[in-house]
Every structure is written in structure tokens, then in C-alpha cells.
Amino acid sequence: LSVQQGPNLLQVRQGSQATLVCQVDQATAWERLRVKWTKDGAILCQPYITNGSLSLGVCGPQGRLSWQAPSHLTLQLDPVSLNHSGAYVCWAAVEIPELEEAEGNITRLFVDPDDPTQNRNRIASFPG
């Protein structure tokens, strides 16, 4: 089981939208996959994916989850608030027949205040 996550760094303006993507690859077929997003070490949500369907569509404040078979999990934050700033990690686990866990690399999300005098460039950096 492996998890690839992106982007590494995401900088967005307050009130806009942020999208975090996670790709889950498993060598053998699974009946039920448990996925999880954490922010700063605390769990935001941890639904199951069964038959290509998510058991939950929400994930933390203003967070929406989607699953695109066979392997893409997306967390969309909309609208983004200053409180969304932090370190996000995507996890995946297969619990049957034996536990197998994997985690992605951190996505650091920076949220700029909605202040027109601060005209910073948006940054989105994906791994390799």
C-alpha cells in the first residue's frame, strides 16, 4: 500500500478554494479501504471506500471529499479561512485480512488574509 500526496506547498487567499490530492496504490485488490485526512496531527475525517463509493462526503470545516476510481482521493476546502492553515496528511489503510497502513507526505497550506494590499503570488508545488 502506498500513498502519494500533493501539492507539497499550497498558498491561497482567504475565501478562495484549496484542493489537496492523494493517490492511493495497492498491489492487491481490496474490498474496503479506510482513508483519512489529518491536520496538524488531528483527524479531520476517516471514511471508508467500498465498491468505489465514499461513506462520507464531508471532512472537517468546509471540507468536501471525493473519490475518483481507481485511486484518487481529493479534499476540497471551500471557502478557505485563516484557520485552514496547517500541515495536512493523507492516510490509507486496509484492515482485512491484515492491517496495512500508508501515509502521504505533508501538504503545507498557507492562507493569506483577504487584503488587497497584500498582493502575493500563489504557490502550488507538487512532488517531483
Epitope: G41, A42, I43, L44, C45, Q46, S55, G60, P97, L99
Partner: antibody, heavy 118, light 107 residues
């Protein structure tokens, strides 16, 4: 501070049912699994099952299927375990416990003593 | 189901001693082994997860080791507050199972 506060001791008659509650505080209730564990006097611990309050999904130890029913109320941040068709074998201390970031129980309730006696 | 065996059900030691509590699984559990402490008043706390990772707030005198089917919990310098019963738990395979416990007492 994370806390799991369980309901008080129960003395019930054989053949009846009981509901044990576990009120969570200090964290987002819908984000973490709540597990239930049985401890008979002077014995080890037995895992009963878990509920994920976020979507209501459950997973039971086969041994407790048909005996235990796990539910959760998001509005009150409370998990419940109903035990039915009670016998003396069900007399035990029952714990609720939160599963942490990974596969371990990082916070436990204080336990609820159930006595089944006629 | 995987059976977890703690062969020593009770153990006596002196304050300051190094104490080792063992746990054996009926099959390989690939380090998915946790340790819990239950105080005489019934309070249960997580000590160690994934064989050797110390849970936050747990004193560093506690440590864990092992692999395959054999695991151990070591208390390097026994203190009065360590008097409790210790349980191992495997989470490699459902249903998750616990050992029978090792009760630690003061000599």
C-alpha cells in the same frame, strides 16, 4: 482535554437489555472511532467493536454480533452500546475507548459495571 | 482469532528495579502491538503503540521491543505509581485481541 465519561453502574435482570453511554468531550467527536471493550472480573480485556460517528459505520467482533449494538448521537457527542438478552455471562465492566491517530486506543472511559442478576 | 499470551500473570519487584513483562502472539503480528496500563482503580492508559513508540506524556522509563510473535514491555526504574496491571493488544488482524494481563506488585 480529551475525556470519555461513561454512564453509571447497572443492575439488571436476565433476559432484559441495557444501554451504556459514553459522552466524549475535548475533541471532534465525528472524527474518531469509539471502541467498546469488555472486562470480566479478574480477567483480560475483550474487544467488542467500534463505531465511527462520522458516518455511523461499525465493525463488530463476531463473538458479540447479535449481542451488542453500537450507535452514536452526533448532536450530544455520545456513543451508546446496547446489550440484549442479558445473562450472567454479560456481567462485566465495559469500557469505551477512542482510537487515536493510528491503531491504538489513546483515551479510555472510566468503565461501567454491569451486573446481571435475578 | 490471534491469541495473546502473557505467561506471567503476576510479578513482584522492588522499587528501582528493572522489570520486563512479556507477551506472545499465536502468529506473526508484524509489530502491531500496543501496551496498556490499568491502575487498581480501573483507569486504563495507553503506554506504547506499534511495539516501541511511546505515547505522549508517558514517562521514558517505559519502553517496548519485539518482533514477529514475541514482544516485551520494560520499566527501567520501577516507581510506586507503576503498580498496575499491564495488557498487550494486537491490532494486526481483526478481531483485535488482548493478553490476559500481568499484575505488577511491590515486594
Amino acid at each position: 482535554e480529551v475525556q470519555l465519561q461513561q454512564s453509571g453502574p447497572e443492575l439488571v435482570k436476565p433476559g432484559t437489555l441495557v444501554n451504556i453511554s459514553c459522552k466524549a468531550s475535548g475533541y471532534t467527536f465525528t472524527s474518531y472511532d469509539i471502541n467498546w471493550v469488555k472486562q470480566r472480573p479478574g480477567q483480560g480485556l475483550e474487544w467488542i467493536g467500534w463505531i465511527y460517528p462520522g458516518d455511523g459505520s461499525t465493525n463488530y467482533n463476531e463473538k458479540f454480533k447479535g449481542k451488542a449494538t453500537l450507535t452514536a448521537d452526533k448532536s450530544s457527542s455520545t456513543a451508546y452500546m446496547q446489550l440484549s438478552s442479558l445473562t450472567s455471562e454479560n456481567s462485566a465492566v465495559y469500557f469505551c475507548a477512542r482510537r487515536g491517530l493510528r491503531y491504538y486506543f489513546d483515551y479510555w472511559g472510566q468503565g461501567t459495571t454491569l451486573t446481571v442478576s435475578s | 482469532d490471534i491469541q495473546m499470551t502473557q505467561t506471567t500473570s503476576s510479578l513482584s519487584a522492588s522499587l528501582g528495579d528493572r522489570v520486563t513483562i512479556s507477551c506472545r502472539a499465536s502468529q506473526d503480528i508484524r509489530n502491531y502491538l500496543n501496551w496498556y496500563q490499568q491502575k487498581p482503580d480501573g483507569t486504563v492508559k495507553l503506554l506504547i503503540y506499534y511495539t516501541s513508540r511511546l505515547h505522549s506524556g508517558v514517562p521514558s522509563r517505559f519502553s517496548g521491543s519485539g518482533s514477529g510473535t514475541d514482544y516485551s514491555l520494560t520499566i527501567s526504574n520501577l516507581e510506586q505509581e507503576d503498580i498496575a496491571t499491564y495488557f498487550c493488544q494486537q491490532v494486526n488482524t481483526l478481531p483485535w485481541t488482548f493478553g490476559g494481563g500481568t499484575k505488577l506488585e511491590i515486594k
